[in-house]
Interface confidence: low
Amino acid sequence: QNLFTKDVTVIEGEVATISCQVNKSDDSVIQLLNPNRQTIYFRDFRPLKDSRFQLLNFSSSELKVSLTNVSISDEGRYFCQLYTDPPQESYTTITVLVPPRNLMIDIQKDTAVEGEEIEVNCTAMASKPATTIRWFKGNTELKGKSEVEEWSDMYTVTSQLMLKVHKEDDGVPVICQVEHPAVTGNLQTQRYLEVQYKPQVHIQMTYPLQGLTREGDALELTCEAIGKPQPVMVTWVRVDDEMPQHAVLSGPNLFINNLNKTDNGTYRCEASNIVGKAHSDYMLYVYDPPTTIPPPTTTTTTTTTTTTTILTIITDSRAGEEGSIRAVDH
């Protein structure tokens, strides 16, 4: 056998090159046939009326033909025949790859609430072979569940991803990425997650700056509430008691002038949005006015636990006065 061919893989719409090569030529006739065994070329003559076939090279040792604008119907075995005695035959298989026609990502809902499980689907239509779909949340790879539908040698792949969302996912892309032999580089589509979450509330003491509240002083607290959507209502209440007469409420700020011991207690900032509500407590302890001129030294320690409880402990260095817990977030 001195007739050789090579298999060809080509992307739909591109050019396939078929080559019949003869090792020890004796000027025998070379012929190329299509999968239906119709003659495409007999030596350098093309009897088949398909102008997509063009002669690239003809000699006693090679018949080389190009097929432009390849379609899936061109797939199959192409036969090279060499009319020696006895005749020789060799075949080359053309495999046509079809990239996915369309890549669609479908998210169950545009806006999700933290803790909710949402379904995301990605569909790669009409490819050959079937497409592999990979999922990413940001740069984290997730495993989806794929279903393959075959129709007329073409495959449509739908991958389903079940995703439990958290507030950290807000603004993070969900990426559907396709892997297919007919696709070079990255073929992907993405949607950015929009996650709504209940407020996180934090109380900031804006006055006095050194953090120690004494009789006669003023106190100003600012309530910071962050959520999505942004909290619609931020309110101050005094737990288990009426708000002092001399307290002034201005939006997120609580101002108490001329503090006295009767103001001792827990002051709560509450914030809510459509997802839920949360609060943070500030425990006010009013100390005696200073007896000496130098101000006392103050130590502030902040401890954060995984339950987002923030404790601010103020310790007065003067003997006889114990530190008190000042703010707790919920």
């Epitope: 949340k137 940001g138 740069n139 984290t140 790879e141 495993k143 996912d169 892309p173 990426i175 950015y192």
Partner: antibody
């Protein structure tokens, strides 16, 4: 040749804020997600956080939230660190992160926290 | 929290095959990566997506992931393979993190 170089590591006292910078050469930072990872002396690797190419969104390890901030310009990725303690003493690496795989790492920059 | 467990140290004779393991409760749902780190050097990616090897990494290194265990296999261990090896995974199921490293395994090549 694609490479990353970190800078800004030095000896600081506890509580001093510090910003580290990661500079890329041979590729455009804008196209890639970028991560910061640290390694305390004699210890293992610890992921700090990642900034995404598309939205510029950041995601942090739970212990890093609030104290560490990652930001990005067209040529650098910064790691801003606050409320530093001796436990934050480590070599800090930046890495090019492509869909969860840290493929290119910088040589690292040493941060020492000591009073 | 999600923890990847690796043996602290493993020994192998020169030229032998060694398997380094990495276990976690839900590792079967995640893809594992492996990194090699030599003293005073940055880590180098060896394996990603459980089994894929970047160009330039010798085919002596291979990866697998089944059940709750990811495995890095080094066949024909060489003196230059002496290093720390870290497994890592991205985990998209929780809200607290999405990337975690194992504690690392120190590989010693003897003989």
């Amino acid at each position: 040749q694609e490479q990353l170089v970190e800078s800004g590591g030095r000896l600081v006292t506890p509580g001093t804020p510090l910003t580290l910078t990661c500079k890329a050469s041979g590729f455009s930072l804008g196209k890639y997600d970028m991560s910061w990872v640290r390694q305390a002396p004699g210890k293992g690797l610890e992921w700090i956080g990642t900034i995404y190419a598309g939205s510029g969104s950041t995601w942090y390890a739970s212990w890093a939230k609030g104290r560490f901030t990652i930001s990005k310009t067209s040529t650098t990725v910064d790691l801003k660190m606050t409320s530093l303690t001796t436990e934050d003493t480590a070599t800090y690496f930046c890495a090019r992160d492509f869909l969860g795989v840290n493929s290119i790492w910088g040589p690292g920059t040493l941060v020492t926290i000591s009073s | 929290s999600f923890v990847l467990t690796q043996p602290a140290s493993v020994q192998v004779n020169l030229g032998q095959t060694v398997s380094l393991t990495c276990t976690a409760d839900t590792l079967s749902r995640s893809y594992a990566s492996w990194y090699q780190q030599k003293p005073d050097q940055a880590p180098v990616l060896l394996i990603h997506r459980d089994t894929s090897r970047p160009s330039g990494v010798p085919d002596r290194f291979s990866g697998s992931n089944s059940g709750n265990t990811a495995t890095l296999t080094i066949s024909g261990a060489q003196a230059g393979d002496e290093a720390d090896y870290y497994c890592a995974t991205s985990d998209g199921s929780g809200s607290n993190f999405h990337f975690v490293f194992g504690g690392g395994t120190q590989l010693t090549v003897t003989g």
